[in-house]
């Protein structure tokens, strides 16, 4: 069966979120990874959507994160703007209303999504052969 | 394959004006920024202007404010520059550059050359 | 607008040195540095952004420090293709600026 084309886009947005950090990027995420030997697929990719759901949510008007030039600014709306994006495909992917996030375990954003990255990297490669 | 191709520069006479295209590839055009870098010959690198593709809204550095203008056709992944009222000293080649998602400028085109002489 | 200053103007050194590439801005600029090298003939390319962070493909001996108004850009074995004009570039504020260049030269 073909690769759905929501996989391709969140490949894709997860290839340029991972291209470069940022300061908030440095920030904690529940860490969703630590431990989800016995989640479905798709309840995986909603956990996530949550975790990405929460992070912008809380930091989108971070002082912290939007720094103090109109660069700063530009580039943590661009980290906003992305994940908006990887949180609205994700859902897609999931096709769940709703999922809990009660890890108590935490990672940098930075590293969710690279661990993120190899787990879409996987589905693609599993469904494209 | 992202890929920046520059294309508009040649001689030109002092006061003249000469608009360059820059055509972008392999990436989605309005994720990242646009920038217009100069490299006089034989000199270093001078920033001319970056432009928010999303939003259209640009930055020019004073050199270059009211006679350089900047523009976008989102529909051809296209970046423009309009030069005008154009010197000898603006001699140069003329770069087009990806901004990187969020630092820095990580794609570059080949560049150029407007030469500006009588 | 931000200037910035690179030192020294050229570097003459052999393969296999420790090239150190400094760069000062004339006020702070926090993190939101960067390095790009320039081959004759070539266009610029990345290295080093949010002063010490490599970018894509940019091998290990690439190194990047500093903070604040002191940049340092750092090959720790010169390999044959290094050789080259390296810039400094701040992304703090616009006007975006560059240094002026350090060519590392082949002694």
């Known amino acids: 069966h073909k690769c759905d084309i929501t996989l391709q886009e969140i490949i894709k947005t997860l290839n340029s979120l991972t291209e470069q950090k940022t300061l908030c990027t440095e920030l904690t995420v529940t860490d969703i990874f630590a431990a989800s030997k016995n989640t479905t697929e798709k309840e995986t990719f909603c956990r996530a959507a949550t975790v990405l759901r929460q992070f912008y949510s809380h930091h989108e008007k971070d002082t912290r994160c939007l720094g103090a030039t109109a660069q700063q600014f530009h580039r943590h709306k661009q980290l906003i703007r992305f994940l908006k994006r990887l949180d609205r495909n994700l859902w897609g992917l999931a096709g769940l209303n709703s999922c809990p996030v009660k890890e108590a375990n935490q990672s940098t954003l930075e590293n969710f999504l690279e661990r993120l990255k190899t787990i879409m990297r996987e589905k693609y490669s599993k469904c494209s052969s | 394959e992202v890929q920046l191709v520059e294309s508009g520069g040649g001689l030109v006479q002092p006061g003249g004006s000469l608009r360059l295209s820059c055509a972008a590839s392999?990436?989605?055009?309005?994720?990242?920024?646009m920038h217009w870098v100069r490299q006089a010959p034989g000199k270093g690198l001078e920033w001319v202007v970056w432009i928010n593709t999303e939003t259209g809204e640009p930055t020019y550095a004073d050199d270059f404010k009211g006679r350089f203008t900047i523009s976008l056709d989102n529909s051809k992944n296209t970046a423009y520059l309009q030069m005008n009222s154009l010197r000898a000293e603006d001699t140069a080649v003329y770069y087009c550059?990806?901004?990187?998602?969020?630092?820095?400028?990580?794609?570059w085109g080949q560049g150029t050359l407007v030469t500006v002489s009588s | 607008e931000i200037v910035l200053t690179q030192s020294p103007a050229t570097l003459s050194l052999s393969p296999g040195e420790r090239a150190t590439l400094s760069c000062k801005a004339s006020q702070s600029v926090i993190n939101d540095a960067a390095w790009y090298q320039q081959k004759p003939g070539q266009a610029p390319r990345l290295l080093i952004y949010y002063t010490s962070h490599r970018y894509t493909g940019i091998p290990a001996r690439f190194s990047g420090s500093g903070s604040g108004t002191d940049f340092t850009l750092t090959i720790s074995s010169l390999e044959p293709e290094d050789f080259a004009v390296y810039y400094c570039q701040q992304d703090y504020t616009s006007p975006w600026t560059f240094g002026q260049g350090t060519k590392v030269e082949i002694k």
């Open positions: 392999g990436y989605t055009f309005t994720d990242y920024s």
């Open positions: 550059a990806r901004g990187g998602i969020f630092y820095g400028m990580d794609y």
